[in-house]
């Protein structure tokens, strides 16, 4: 029950996180005009990964896409790439995790397969979250660098009569959305990995086996692995040797003075 809850919660948290990463990537407010200590203008500038916008005081907003690919800063391209990789990995992770959910029964899928899928999706969520956090952090670092550079420029070369106002940019809402979303995806991924441990069969999960001396040869029964189907049933694999070793689950067990447990 706890495993199912952990897995389900991990899935939901990751889903919210990935939705947030997608939202952050699409948002225009990655950087917004810094209004502190600046002359009050009737125009507000903000920029995203894909376009820059200007909102006039009247409410009129004009956005222009970055139609060049080669002319854009390498850092911006890197951020775009990180966010897209994060979204793609997250989307694949979500797809995998749907099939891995313990509460969803798909054919005769074993717990070991579900465990592997849960682990795979968990790792994908972790990497997706890290990509988003890295992308947002790279952009934030770029903003901080540019902010102090433009601040330095503001206080130099003002000897003439004409003053030039340098537009400085600060953190936009998308950065915070991205950080939170990346964190949620990461947490969701960790939860999926934890859930995987509870789903995975133990390495030597054989029940107590009775051995008794038989003839000279022990014949191996063909079709040695029994795969148990059925939701919630014991899916532990049992190797069955005819006359040699039988599990306690087997009804016909003939104890004799040679038996050891």
């Amino acid at each position: 029950m706890a495993v199912t809850a952990c897995q389900g919660l991990g899935f939901v948290v990751s889903l919210i996180g990935i939705a947030g990463i997608i939202a952050a990537t699409c948002m225009d407010q990655w950087s917004t005009q810094d209004l502190y200590n600046n002359p009050v203008t009737a125009v507000f500038n903000y920029q995203g990964l894909w376009r820059s916008c200007v909102r006039e005081s009247s409410g009129f907003t004009e956005c222009r896409g970055y139609f060049t690919l080669l002319g854009l800063p390498a850092m911006l391209q890197a951020v775009r790439a990180l966010m897209i990789v994060g979204i793609v990995l997250g989307a694949i992770g979500l797809l995998v995790s749907i099939f891995a959910l313990k509460c969803i029964r798909i054919g005769s899928m074993e717990d070991s397969a579900k465990a592997n899928m849960t682990l795979t999706s968990g790792i994908m969520f972790i990497v997706s979250g890290l990509c988003a956090i890295a992308g947002v952090s790279v952009f934030a670092n770029m903003l901080v660098t540019n902010f102090w550079m433009s601040t330095a420029n503001m206080y130099t070369g003002m000897g003439g009569m004409v003053q030039t106002v340098q537009t400085r940019y600060t953190f936009g809402a998308a950065l915070f959305v991205g950080w939170v979303a990346g964190g949620l995806t990461l947490i969701g991924g960790v939860m999926m990995c934890i859930a995987c441990r509870g789903l995975a069969p133990e390495e030597t999960n054989y029940k107590a086996v009775s051995y008794h001396a038989s003839g000279h040869s022990v014949a191996y029964k063909p079709g040695g692995f029994k795969a148990s189907t059925g939701f919630g049933s014991n899916t532990k694999n049992k190797k069955i040797y005819d006359g040699g070793a039988r599990t306690e689950d087997e009804v016909q067990s003939y104890p004799s003075k040679h038996d050891y447990v």
Partner: antibody, heavy 118, light 113 residues
């Protein structure tokens, strides 16, 4: 069509409060704001302030302590209040619609002459 | 506050001849975000209210004759009348529409010689 009409007392005593109303038609007050501008006799234009469609206001720093611009959407009216008036406030007062593009002023009222005298 | 300086104060012109009015601002009116200059030109005919001719420094208002054109960027702007007509007589103002408070230039009076 877009119309703006200023109204108010033509004569105000010094130290009193000047109250003007701008009645508008032909446009939505939720989309457009209004600027107030004045022009002393024989002189140039002086921007007083603006109230934007969202309700935010900006004023001329020289008049900020004395001026208030407000809107009454139910009456389709904008109002200007200027306190502690002196003879220097004698002017033609205009209201003008805040243009949607370029932060300009696209339609102007005819203006109303206000004289400050005892 | 941003200071808008217009020149000349008075501009006597001959009908059919071109006219040019200069406007300088103490701070740049160019917005880096959209590369637009927030400068507006107004015309005030004698006894009338002002009307907007040009916004964004060079975009003509609808209904304004195309003999009026605006140019310039940053701090230096110009209003040109390609061929002056009798109805162009009046005072022309430039306005800063970028920084609060919005400020007007002192005005340039265009009159026929």
């Amino acid at each position: 069509q877009v119309q703006l009409q200023e109204s108010g007392p033509g004569l105000v005593k010094p130290s009193e409060t000047l109250s003007l109303t701008c009645t508008v038609s032909g446009f939505s007050l939720t989309t457009y704001g209004v600027h107030w501008i004045r022009q002393p006799p024989g002189k140039g234009l002086e921007w007083i302030g603006v109230i934007w469609a969202g309700g935010s206001t900006n004023y001329n720093s020289a008049l900020m302590s004395r001026v208030t611009i407000s809107v009454d959407t139910s009456k389709n009216q904008f109002s200007l209040k200027l306190s502690s008036v002196t003879a220097a406030d004698t002017a033609v007062y205009y209201c003008a619609r805040a243009a949607y593009y370029g932060n300009g002023l696209d339609y102007w009222g005819q203006g109303t002459m206000v004289t400050v005298s005892s | 506050d941003v200071v808008m300086t217009q020149s000349p104060l008075s501009l006597p012109v001959t009908l059919g001849q071109p006219a040019s009015i200069s406007c300088k601002s103490s701070q740049t009116l160019l917005n880096s975000g959209n590369q637009k200059n927030y400068l507006t030109w107004f015309q005030q005919r004698p006894g009338q209210s002002p009307r907007r001719l040009i916004y964004w420094a060079s975009t003509g208002e609808s209904g304004v004759p195309d003999r009026f054109s605006g140019s310039g960027s940053g701090t230096d702007f110009t209003l040109k009348i390609s061929r002056v007509e009798a109805e162009d007589v009046g005072v022309y103002y430039c306005q800063n529409a970028y920084f609060y408070p919005f400020t007007f230039g002192g005005g340039t009076k265009v009159e026929i010689k």
